[in-house]
């Protein structure tokens, strides 16, 4: 017998429309109901809602709402979770890895946590550790492979070796930056005694009785003596390396400064030569500066003579540069000897070697060259054609040849052409036109003509202008355009009205304010008439203001 299912009590969720549905329970096997899960819980399919089914064995799924854990709830210092999921369901496990130099509490590089009914099983932990170090002439006293922060590792030296004066055991400590030092023991016979003394000099530190191998000691010379060789000696195989020598410094003669002088040089001259280490202020002449770019500085007496060796350097001024169609963007106005300055050419201009920028150098006699920016043209856009040459930049007056694709031409029958680089760019565009889209001469019009001499053939988009004869009114556009082998609609020339003395006499009228025998009016013009002396109007007042309409005018009449 099929057992019915009682109303399902869903932990951490519920049926949709619970109170309405409660009345229909118990339910027969085969029935299904939609249900939802509370926050932090999902259906076995990972959704927040699904269907619960009444089966022969009761409700399915048996656990409709499963606990979820969020990756964002995991705080992991010095480690990371590499998996991409952000939500994990009940009993699901996720791996975490510790950063290099860190390990789990068990000493592993990675660990795992599990999503349980009350959240994550534990917060992952990554602890600072130190690897077993490399021992030199020594061995560790303990056997671990991982050492936590502040852990101590004792070591002992092999026979005939010691860590420091007479000690054969020592300890190292695991710190934030690794081991406090390396567990190294030295051959006792390789220690050194005090470093050797040198004439006119001494060590910078107080000498000890014993120095370990690879110890370093620094020397310094007395005043007016210069150190020659390395200032350090190193203990190796029980001996010190070669110590330096302290050499007496040579004196300096009075400095003859080209393009400059010592301050108070006449006063100072008697005191020369002088010992090394002495310094004197000096200045440079106009258009010259010290190596630091100032007009004055100090000159120093050294073992090798005066420093700087060239106290006064030539300067070049930005204002001496004439650069047409270009500019110098650097802000300095003065440049010293051998200093290079960049200049840029304006758009559409380039250096002689075709670049957009160049450089000049300040030499002993001034600038190396005057910068030059020459007009150039870029490779143009080809329309139904291709270029013959390969340059990207073309100088003023350069010619560029091009050829048309099949079915295209430049002008009547021509399939190759040239363009010239001019002051305003290319002479024209390298365009080829579809032969079938060209037009013949534009159509003639009555009482008018084109303003230009007619050609046999016109390329697409050519425009031709029309004009009418005197007194004829142009109606429509005064231009026609060639498109798809046809000209657009040409304009019309509308007849003028000719006001004759004969017609005026017939109607006993004359022009108002005019004494013309013959008068021409354009379409739309108003012509004012009046009765001749001794005659009166026989038509309406309005008829005396007649309008010209395409060559026809209605005359008023006087009797």
């Amino acid at each position: 017998e099929v057992k019915p299912c009682d109303f399902p009590e869903i932990q951490h969720g519920g049926l949709y429309y619970k109170s309405l549905r409660r009345l229909y329970f118990p339910a027969a096997a085969g029935q299904s109901y939609s249900y939802y899960c509370d926050q932090n819980f999902v259906t076995p399919s990972g959704s927040y809602w699904d269907y619960i089914h009444c089966t022969q064995d009761g409700w399915s799924p048996t656990v409709p709402c499963l606990r979820t854990c969020s990756k964002s709830d995991v705080e992991i210092e010095n480690g990371f979770i590499s998996e991409s999921s952000s939500i994990y369901i009940l009993n699901e496990e996720t791996q975490y890895n510790c950063k290099p130099g860190y390990a789990t509490a068990e000493g592993n590089s990675s660990g795992s946590i599990t999503c349980l009914q009350n959240g994550w099983s534990t917060q992952p932990i990554c602890i600072k550790f130190c690897d077993m170090p490399v021992f030199e002439n020594s061995r560790a006293k303990s056997n671990g492979m991982w050492f936590k922060l502040h852990d101590t590792l004792d070591y002992e030296c092999y026979d005939g070796y010691e860590s420091s004066y007479g000690n054969t055991t020592d300890s190292i400590v695991c710190g934030e930056d690794g081991w406090s030092h390396l567990p190294t023991c030295y051959n006792s016979s390789e220690n050194c005694g005090p470093p050797p003394p040198i004439s006119n000099g001494d060590t910078t530190s107080f000498p000890q009785k014993v120095y370990l191998p690879w110890s370093r000691v620094e020397y310094q010379c007395q005043s007016y003596y210069e150190l020659q060789g390395s200032k350090y000696v190193t203990c190796s195989n029980g001996d010190w390396s070669e110590p330096p020598r302290c050499i007496s410094m040579k004196p300096c003669e009075f400095p003859e400064i080209q393009h400059g002088h010592l301050y108070y040089e006449n006063t100072r001259r008697p005191y020369f030569p002088v010992a090394t280490g002495q310094s004197y202020s000096y200045y440079c002449d106009q258009n010259f500066v010290t190596p630091s770019g100032s007009y004055w500085d100090y000159i120093h007496c050294t073992q090798d003579g005066w420093l700087p060796t060239v106290p006064c350097l030539r300067t070049c001024s930005k204002s001496d540069i004439e650069i047409e169609n270009g500019f110098i963007s650097e802000s300095s106005s003065i440049y010293i000897l051998n200093k290079e300055i960049q200049y840029k050419c304006k758009p559409g201009y380039a250096t002689a070697d075709g670049n957009s920028s160049g450089s000049i150098t300040c030499l002993q006699n001034g600038w190396s060259a005057q910068p030059i920016c020459i007009k150039f043209c870029d490779m143009p856009v080809f329309e139904n054609s291709r270029a013959k040459s390969n340059g990207m930049r073309f100088k003023l007056h350069d010619t560029l040849d091009y050829e048309c694709y099949d079915g295209y031409e430049i002008s009547y029958g021509n399939t190759t052409g040239s363009i010239v680089c001019g002051e305003d760019g290319w002479s024209h565009f390298p365009t080829c036109y579809n032969s079938s889209e060209k037009c013949g001469p534009p159509p003639p019009i009555s009482n008018g003509d084109t303003t230009s001499f007619l050609l046999k053939v016109y390329v697409p988009q050519s425009r031709v202008e029309y004009q009418c004869q005197s007194y004829y009114e142009l109606q429509g556009s005064n231009y026609v355009t060639c498109s798809n082998g046809e000209w657009s609609e040409p304009p019309r020339c509308i007849h003028p009205c000719i006001i004759t003395e004969e017609n005026m006499n017939k109607n006993n009228i004359q022009l108002k304010g005019k004494s013309d025998i013959k008068y021409y009016a354009k379409t739309g013009d108003t012509i004012e008439f009046m009765c001749k002396l001794g005659y009166n109007a026989n038509t309406s007042v309005l008829s005396f203001q007649a309008v010209c309409r395409e060559g026809i005018v209605e005359y008023p009449r006087c009797e």
Partner: antibody
Framework: QVQLQESGPGLVKPSETMSLTCTVS????????WSWIRQPPGKGLEWIGY???????KSNPSLKSRVTISVDTSKNQFSLKLSSVTAADTAVYYC?????????????WGQGTLVTVSS | DIVMTQSPDSLAVSLGERATINCKSS????????????LAWYHQKPGQPPKLLIY???TRESGVPDRFSGSGSGTDFTLTISSLQAEDVAVYYC?????????FGQGTKVEIK
């Protein structure tokens, strides 16, 4: 490495239209000109024409009335159609690349395909 | 059309000896705007497509041995193989790309004596 591969029927009847396709792989298709060149058995090389990726063409005037060269940039292919073929059109047909946008030399060639015109 | 004429039609040279092929164009292929000669040399081995050796009359293509060199300007050009090797046996073609239609020389067959 740029590779060109010709494909099409090896035998065509007289007076019919011959169709060949060249597929380009391993390099850019745009920015170049793509040519057809043929070589009758035991003879020299004859340029048939080129096509630009934009569709612009130029053909040898000696064949122009019979030649159609087209391009399909979506497939990196270009094609040759030669109409009203005769036995004189029997040749190995090569496709080749002209190196640059301007007039240039042929730096890559296909292996060639032999087309025989016979009834 | 620009006609390209090669001489000789065939050439037999001993291994290690110099081989010289001439090419003459019916009009100049020197383009004044960039001072370049629009001429290339190719060689073709049996059953293979032509292979580019020299372009701009004298520039060797990448990977081509330096025993191959090109010279000349305007209408007269020369391809020289300084020391012939067995693998150089082929038909050699010159080609102009100055104008359309592109045209090739009739070819020069190089063999070992």
């Amino acid at each position: 490495q740029v590779q060109l591969q010709e494909s099409g029927p090896g035998l065509v009847k007289p007076s019919e239209t011959m169709s060949l396709t060249c597929t380009v792989s391993g390099g850019s298709f745009t920015g170049y000109y793509w040519s057809w060149i043929r070589q009758p058995p035991g003879k020299g090389l004859e340029w048939i024409g080129y096509v630009h990726y934009s569709g612009g063409t130029k053909s040898n005037p000696s064949l122009k009335s019979r030649v159609t060269i087209s391009v399909d940039t979506s497939k990196n292919q270009f094609s040759l159609k030669l109409s009203s073929v005769t036995a004189a059109d029997t040749a190995v047909y090569y496709c080749a690349r002209e190196r640059y946008e301007w007039n240039s030399y042929f730096d890559y060639w296909g292996q060639g395909t032999l087309v025989t015109v016979s009834s | 059309d620009i006609v390209m004429t090669q001489s000789p039609d065939s050439l037999a040279v001993s291994l290690g000896e110099r081989a010289t092929i001439n090419c003459k164009s019916s009009q100049s292929v020197l383009y004044s705007s960039n001072n370049k000669n629009y001429l290339a040399w190719y060689h073709q081995k049996p059953g293979q497509p032509p292979k580019l050796l020299i372009y701009w009359a004298s520039t060797r293509e990448s990977g081509v041995p330096d025993r191959f060199s090109g010279s000349g300007s305007g209408t007269d050009f020369t391809l020289t193989i300084s020391s012939l090797q067995a693998e150089d046996v082929a038909v050699y073609y010159c080609q102009q790309y100055y104008s359309s239609p592109r045209t090739f020389g009739q070819g020069t067959k190089v063999e070992i004596k």
